[in-house]
């Protein structure tokens, strides 16, 4: 494709006060938004949608609701206890005509292992998905259905970034017109064939994902077929040519010195906001060394933090990050040794990431103590290990078979971890709760939407 093609979907990303509460600062929230958008940008750019290539994403605007907005009556996301359908509806009740898609990120524990919800696009005659404009629906309310939501919490635990990135790609996949994967070709993770199964399921799998299998961040042929049809019909309605950075989105992009947002958001003494004239906006103010929008190693007084200052906490697998005194960015942290236990002894560190299973420490690989294998249901939320490529040896870490490594100690999966061959997630009581992939959809049928919309919402 040539650069003149309309291939960029512009996003409006809002975060609620709970998301802010978890990440702690505006900068940390912006870093999360940035990493999520980069992740889906990589996935979509590298996918050939039946000849439509280089689909990319750009944040056009962000709104960060801080803990100070928890009581603000103009903040629609202030309510503490709302279900996932209502949360999506609150997003949809805003007018998002200026955007390809509008998302809200939260840190809420929705029922039944739901990590996200989005309206599904269709090539014609549908309401929902990319480029959809605000209109009046049968419940008497105007709604924008170019929307979705994601949460970073599941059964009381926070999901790993790679899972959250795939959740975002999955929900956006719905907006782009893909339903959940079905059929043997598009759900290889359910296959009895070991060679197919080991690569896992694709992005649009209906239930759980671990995010670390080969197919987990790829679209299936089923998804590609569906998305291609929607892109063909809809992308000219609101996609833009890629290229220019967007001053005001809070992210420092190529061609910008800094970006503290628009005048109503900019709390930065160092950077000209996006409402300033063309030559000044998103540039450092005279005499200022840096802006906190560039990274955590810049002070509010616009100077680089000193060499010894911490900019990133120590984690299970990496040492703390320390500013180097000459850049606003936080330098990469030194990794802890490979095979250091992490995630409460359920995993091990690989190259600074908590990525491998504890089984790998002993030359084994993780497996699912799945009930289809005749295992006791009580073992579904145990960490189970097997010899490489030999499912007949799959046994709990608490079993006698692996007692030489685990001394008979049962290691349980963290709440929110996939279980029973990715059919569900473990809850806080170590029960494997199956994901009802269409639960919110079923509930919505009883709610305020008219029948023609029923098909167009999905997790």
């Amino acid at each position: 494709t040539t650069s003149a093609e309309k291939n960029t979907c512009q996003l409006y990303i809002q975060t609620d006060h709970l998301f802010f509460k978890y990440y702690g600062t505006r900068e940390a929230v912006i870093a999360q938004i940035s990493s999520h958008v980069k992740a889906i940008d990589t996935i979509y750019q590298t996918t050939d949608f039946s000849g439509i290539r280089n689909i990319s994403f750009m944040v056009k605007r962000i709104r960060i609701n801080t803990t100070a907005d928890e009581k603000d009556p103009t903040n629609p996301f202030r309510f503490p206890n709302i279900g996932v359908e209502k949360f999506l509806e609150l997003n949809s009740e805003q007018n998002h005509d200026d955007y390809c898609l509008a998302y809200v990120f939260t840190d809420r524990d929705f029922d039944d292992g739901v990590l996200g919800l989005a309206w599904v696009g269709a090539p014609s005659g549908s309401s929902g998905g990319i480029c959809e404009k605000s209109k009046l629906y049968s419940d008497g309310k105007k709604k924008s259905l170019n929307t979705g939501i994601i949460t970073v919490q599941n059964y009381g635990s926070h999901v790993p970034p790679k899972v959250s990135h795939i959740t975002f790609a999955h929900e956006v996949g719905h907006n782009f017109g893909s339903p959940h994967d079905s059929g043997t070709e598009c759900t290889p993770g359910e296959s009895k064939n070991l060679g197919q199964k080991e690569n896992g399921n694709y992005i649009m799998y209906a239930r759980a994902t671990s995010g670390d299998k080969l197919n987990n961040n790829k679209f299936s042929l089923c998804s590609i077929r569906n998305i291609s049809q929607v892109l063909e019909k809809k992308r000219n309605n609101c996609f833009v040519e890629s290229g220019q950075p967007i001053c005001g989105n809070g992210m420092v992009e190529q061609g910008e010195e800094c970006d503290c947002g628009y005048s109503d958001q900019c709390k930065d003494e160092c950077c000209f906001d996006a409402n300033q004239p063309e030559g000044r906006k998103c540039k450092l103010k005279p005499g200022k060394q840096c802006s906190p929008s560039q990274g955590p190693c810049c002070t509010a007084q616009c100077a680089f933090k000193s060499k010894s200052e911490k900019c990133r906490d120590d984690s299970d697998c990496a040492r703390e990050g320390i500013c180097n005194g000459f850049t606003a960015l936080c330098p990469a942290s030194d990794p802890k040794p490979n095979f250091t236990d992490c995630n409460r002894h359920t995993q091990v560190c690989i190259n600074g990431q908590c990525a491998g299973s504890i089984c790998e420490k002993y030359g084994l690989e993780e497996c699912t103590c799945a009930s289809s294998d005749g295992k006791d249901d009580k073992e579904l939320c145990h960490v189970c290990c097997m010899k490489k490529m030999d499912p007949s040896t799959c046994a709990s870490t608490g079993s006698v078979q692996w007692s030489r490594h685990f001394s008979g100690r049962t290691i349980t999966l963290q709440p929110g971890s996939p279980c029973n061959d990715f059919r569900g997630y473990c809850d806080v009581f170590m029960r494997c709760r199956l994901v009802d992939a269409d639960g919110p959809l079923a509930r919505l049928k009883k709610a305020i939407f008219s029948p023609e919309l029923y098909e167009n919402i999905a997790e």
Partner: nanobody, 123 residues
């Protein structure tokens, strides 16, 4: 090449004793677990006892607890199964098996196997 050779089988009267030996070669003995299994005609192979060489921890099937004892001689790379108070139902081909990772009495978990030695207990 990993090799396991069983010996010590034979014909014995009910109530008698036998000591089976399993001589191992071709691997680092201390890194492995060694298990004894048996298979009677027309029946599935079942676990009898096992030992983790590194820490000498042992495990027994309920049917042989108190009658059989497993032990190892690390200098000789050999594992023994002392069988006392033998019963006719102990009649089977006895196999030893070795594995670097696993332990216990499930034959699926063991990678290396000997040829077996016949034990017959007459009444």
């Amino acid at each position: 090449k990993v090799q396991l050779v069983e010996s010590g089988g034979g014909l014995v009267q009910a109530g008698g004793s036998l000591r089976l030996s399993c001589a191992a070669s071709g691997f680092t003995f201390g890194d492995y677990a060694i298990g004894w299994f048996r298979q009677a005609p027309g029946k599935e192979r079942e676990g009898v006892s096992c030992i983790s060489i590194s820490d000498s921890s042992t495990y027994y099937a309920d049917s042989v607890k108190g009658r059989f004892t497993i032990s190892s001689d690390n200098a000789k790379n050999t594992v023994y199964l002392q069988m006392n108070s033998l019963k006719p139902e102990d009649t089977a081909v006895y196999y030893c098996a070795a594995d670097r990772l696993a332990y216990g009495l499930d034959p699926n978990f063991y990678d290396y196997w000997g040829q077996g030695t016949q034990v017959t207990v007459s009444s």
